[in-house]
């Protein structure tokens, strides 16, 4: 798995809805693959972390003044939906095919 | 200033182009306000950090398993352009009114 010394990358993160208290309204799935963005944004920032100009600038400033300015951060830059079966206001089980922004599609340095 | 104990917010970051080696092609300005996103993404994530569903989920998982999963990260969620004077291929000083993605407009938890 990607630790602090690894470069920014997408890693597995299985989320159980019971663990986060969402099982009260999400019927299924019981768990899903959320993924997590882990690792550092080290100089030089590679193309695969799709850095913004600001991230590049911040990385260069961090290189010059490491105690003054932090590195850019490895975060989700593109998210994907999942499908969930949930209870609506009337308690009726309803399928939402695209519950947006739940799973990481891509990670990058921001 | 926003430290590790502060909530995610936009803070000042003056960047001198000479410090990052960009003075070789950016003639002016000599420095600019880039801003930096600093502070933590603590539970519960406030509306002003515009959290994605994934950031909310990750925050809840971190609450349950703090050693296994990291907090969401405070990063630029909206960037602004700056204007720069640079030399083109012929060495002609040219103004780029909108050099995109250089300054933080908004920070959020991702």
């Amino acid at each position: 798995s990607a630790g602090a010394g690894s470069h920014c990358q997408k890693t597995s993160l299985r989320v159980n809805f019971e663990d986060i208290g969402w099982d009260s309204w999400i019927i299924a799935p019981k768990e899903y693959e959320a993924y997590e963005c882990k690792g550092g944004c080290f100089f030089p920032l590679a193309d695969d972390v799709t850095p913004t100009k600001h991230a590049i600038v911040q990385t260069l400033v961090h290189l010059k003044f490491p105690t003054k300015v932090g590195k850019a951060c490895c975060v989700p830059t593109k998210l994907s939906p999942i499908s969930v079966l949930y209870k609506d206001d009337m308690g009726v089980p309803t399928l939402k095919y695209h519950y947006e922004g739940m799973s990481v599609a891509e990670c990058g340095c921001r | 200033s926003a430290g590790a104990g502060s909530h995610c917010q936009k803070t000042s970051l003056r960047v001198n182009f000479e410090d990052i080696g960009w003075d070789s092609w950016i003639i002016a300005p000599k420095e600019y306000e880039a801003y930096e996103c600093k502070g933590g993404c603590f539970f519960p994530l406030a509306d002003d950090v515009t959290p994605t569903k994934h950031a909310i989920v990750q925050t809840l998982v971190h609450l349950k398993f703090p050693t296994k999963v990291g907090k969401a990260c405070c990063v630029p969620t909206k960037l602004s352009p700056i204007s720069v004077l640079y030399k083109d291929d012929m060495g002609v000083p040219t103004l780029k009114y909108h050099y995109e993605g250089m300054s933080v407009a908004e920070c959020g938890c991702r």
Partner: antibody, heavy 119, light 111 residues
């Protein structure tokens, strides 16, 4: 080597017309704003007009003193810029310089051509 | 329009000495942290030549004895040490807004 060569000017009567042309070489003409700047005898410099790029829809701007009388145009395929001068006045007399540059500066200058408006 | 006023109108400087030409704008020519001020040199019978751009940057091939400073409304062109080939007219010029305007010029001569 960058070169801007203006056409020969000349003598024209007040109220008359003249067309100046300027042929450019040594740079990518279509990438640069083109301008005309003039200098009355023994006097200072006055910007007359400019024409921007194709991406700017060849936008033109004129000094108040010539607006409505002068027209600037360009032909990128010929690397040339033109100044059509109508209803000429004695105060239009001077050396007319063709200049190329950016949205910030006059970078390239021709040697200039003398236009004399006199009866 | 932005009016540029140069001082002095003419200046005589000994060879090896310092020549200072000032240019004052009727309003600030700074924007975005950039000074929209340039300086041109014109020798008799020649077109103007770009000396200094963005207030303080030397044009291509311009000798180090030419320097520019200033911001906002007040700008200075300095020539040091003065050399015989520096005899010319000097013009400041702003490109902050159309119409781009020039100062009236300063004639530099040898004392």
């Amino acid at each position: 080597e960058v070169q801007l060569v203006e056409s020969r000017g000349g003598l024209v009567q007040p109220g008359g017309s003249m067309r100046l042309s300027c042929a450019a070489s040594g740079f990518t003409f279509s990438n640069y704003w083109m301008n005309w700047v003039r200098q009355a005898p023994g006097k200072g410099l006055e910007w007359v007009a400019h024409i921007r790029l194709k991406s700017d829809n060849y936008a033109t701007h004129y000094a108040e003193s010539v607006r409505g009388r002068f027209t600037i145009s360009r032909d990128d395929s010929k690397s040339s810029v033109y100044l059509q001068m109508n209803s000429l006045k004695t105060e239009d007399t001077g050396i007319y310089y063709c200049t190329g540059g950016s949205n910030y500066v006059f970078a390239f200058w021709g040697q200039g051509t003398l236009v004399t408006v006199s009866s | 329009d932005i009016v540029l006023t140069q001082s002095p109108d003419s200046l005589a400087v000994s060879l090896g000495e310092r020549a200072t030409i000032n240019c004052r704008a009727s309003e600030s020519v700074d924007n975005y942290g950039i000074s929209f001020m340039n300086w041109f040199q014109q020798k008799p019978g020649q077109p103007p030549k770009l000396l200094i751009y963005a207030a303080s940057n030397q044009g291509s091939g311009v000798p180090d004895r030419f320097s520019g400073s200033g911001s906002g409304t007040d700008f200075t062109l300095t020539i040091s040490p003065m050399q015989a080939e520096d005899v010319a007219m000097y013009f400041c010029q702003q490109s902050k807004e159309v119409p781009w305007t020039f100062g009236q010029g300063t004639k530099l001569e040898i004392k």
